[in-house]
């Protein structure tokens, strides 16, 4: 994860808007470290923000943040919640591993500190809006966002916004109950209800949950998460992924002239985002468990953009 | 935490009914399907049969098909289990359970039915 | 309908040992659809075992299940004194559920 470019100029003014400004204290002055007697955006408005376009999705580890100084009083965002979005229109408060409250940030304690704030799970939003919720004397802003995949790929594919069609999505097996049938197609990240993902007939290494992009897709990273049922945690702790052009002839992802192995989930309802490096040209992609607890049970994202995207 | 509890114990004269209660705590009755099952004194257990609250189907064990009703009332998060015509072999403990994820992980404490003329 | 038949009938065993309990179906299944219960007398049935071996949330690792197709074992590697009950085996799935009759394990 590197800076996003706040502090570099990289993310232009434009990019930077804001509800509102104290004077001359700007959105586009927002950023990490700046300098000058007025050398940050500032607000003297109770319910305020400040919104980040990075022009296409990222996925965005964590923020710096900062205050600044006016004469001898300091300015900075004590507690702070974030909204991302992928369009603009539909936000969504940052929740963490909650499903139900919203995450409050600790922000800043002075004027001059960087307090480091990580988003675990990451986000992947074209747009970040942050809601300062307790500041001293105004809400005054100098920050970073980190994060990756400046070159725009790392857009999700479909798999949690059902672009990718159940009939897309396929499995060596699948478990039913009475009520209950957790088919490949349930296999979609944050999805909710009764049987809200892949599980397997039977859980060995030799079962696979494949997806069809339908065409030849650059795919730069997957996301995982498992699922639980009232008491009990079920998730994939490694897997292997591999990929075809035909659907036939399959090729595991190697890193360094051996089979990779992904670190998968730690719990439940994490989302745990791999990179893959180097990216995959693939039309099919299929995830292998080798390792889990109590069940094999799978949520996934697939992230990339299309190869002609590229050129 | 996740409680079924269900309701006292039932004498009844044989060919009258019981309906059995199963009140679920710490989720929605609707999340999970409920089960029903039966133990005769000093026996072993029997499955009666499952109802989904969710679809309001359910699936009844053959040997109680035609005497036993499932329903549920989502508004208070209670299942029941009607048992009609009743005969002395039907005296027994009967537990609901439901699934977590795929077996019975979580019972009622039984509800002890006594049918005796 | 799959029968269960369970063997044997009665254990006696003392704590510390080791107890192996079978499960034999009438015609094959998935092991998917297995799982194992322990009862105490008063008490509700205690899932032990699903998946034919997995261990339920909170069961200790001397209970180990195993097996396929027809025969399931259940297996408990050291007795302690409250493992001594009544244990029964069970075919879940997406029709009828079946119990076997039940093992009833007993301090010798």
């Known amino acids: 994860q590197t800076p996003l470019g706040m502090a570099s100029g990289h993310i232009r003014d434009f990019q930077i808007t804001a509800s509102g400004q104290y004077g001359q204290w700007a959105p586009k002055l927002a950023r990490l470290h700046y300098s000058g007697s007025i050398n940050a955006w500032s607000t003297k408005e109770p319910f305020s923000w400040i919104k980040v376009d990075l022009l296409a999705p990222m996925i965005i580890h964590g923020i710096k943040t900062q205050g600044a100084r006016q004469k001898f009083s300091s300015l900075y965002i004590s507690q702070f919640i974030i909204m991302y979005s992928l369009d603009g229109k539909k936000w969504q408060t940052y929740r963490g591993n909650s499903t139900g409250t919203l995450m409050v940030f600790f922000g800043n304690v002075d004027s001059s500190g960087i307090k480091h704030n990580i988003f675990n799970p990451p986000i992947i939003a074209r747009y970040i809006r942050l809601h300062p919720t307790h500041y001293s004397i105004r809400s005054t802003l100098r920050m970073e966002l980190m994060g990756c995949d400046l070159n725009s790929c790392s857009m999700p594919l479909g798999m949690e916004s059902k672009a990718i069609s159940d009939a897309q999505i396929t499995a060596s097996s699948y478990f039913t109950n009475m009520f209950a049938t957790w088919s490949p197609s349930k296999a979609r990240l944050h999805l909710q209800g009764r049987s809200n993902a892949w599980r397997p007939q039977v859980n060995n290494p030799k079962e696979w949950l494949q997806v069809d992009f339908q065409k030849t897709m650059k795919v730069t990273g997957v996301t995982t998460q498992g699922v639980k049922s009232l008491l009990t945690s079920m998730y994939v702790k490694e897997f292997l992924i591999s990929s075809s052009q035909d659907g036939h002839q399959w090729t595991l992802f190697f890193q360094n002239g051996k089979v990779k192995v992904f670190q998968g989930n730690q719990d439940s309802f994490t989302p745990v985002v791999n990179s893959l490096d180097p990216p995959l040209l693939t039309r099919y992609l299929r995830i292998h468990p080798q390792s889990w607890v109590h069940q094999i049970a799978l949520r996934m994202e697939v992230l990339g953009c299309e190869a002609q995207d590229l050129y | 935490q996740v409680q079924l509890v269900q309701s006292g114990a039932e004498v009844k004269k044989p060919g009258a009914s019981v309906k059995v209660s199963c009140k679920v705590s710490?989720?929605?009755?609707?999340?999970?399907?409920v089960h029903w099952v039966g133990q005769a004194p000093g026996k072993g257990l029997e499955w009666v049969g499952s109802?989904?609250?969710?679809?309001?189907?359910?699936i009844y064990a053959r040997e109680f098909q035609g005497s036993v009703t499932m329903t549920a009332d989502t508004s208070t998060d209670i299942a029941y289990m009607e048992l009609s015509s009743l005969r002395s072999d039907d005296t027994a403990v009967y537990y609901c359970?439901?699934?977590?994820?795929?077996?019975?992980?979580?019972w009622g404490q039984g509800t002890m039915v006594t049918v005796s003329s | 309908e799959i029968a269960l038949t369970q063997s044997p009938g009665t254990l006696s065993l003392s704590p510390g040992e080791r107890a192996t309990l079978s499960c034999r179906a009438s015609q094959s299944f998935s092991s998917s659809y297995l799982a194992w219960y322990q009862q105490k007398p008063g008490q509700a049935p205690r899932l032990l075992i699903y998946g034919a071996s997995t261990r339920a949330t909170g069961i200790p690792d001397r209970f180990s299940g195993s097996g396929s197709g027809t025969d399931f074992t259940l297996t408990i590697s050291r007795l302690e004194p409250e493992d001594f009950a009544v244990y029964y085996c069970?075919?879940?799935?997406?029709?009828?559920?079946?119990f076997g009759q039940g093992t009833r394990l007993e301090i010798k």
């Open positions: 109802f989904d609250p969710e679809s309001g189907e359910s």
């Open positions: 069970q075919k879940y799935g997406t029709s009828a559920i079946t």
């Open positions: 710490g989720y929605t009755l609707t999340e999970l399907p």
């Open positions: 359970a439901v699934p977590d994820p795929d077996a019975f992980d979580i």
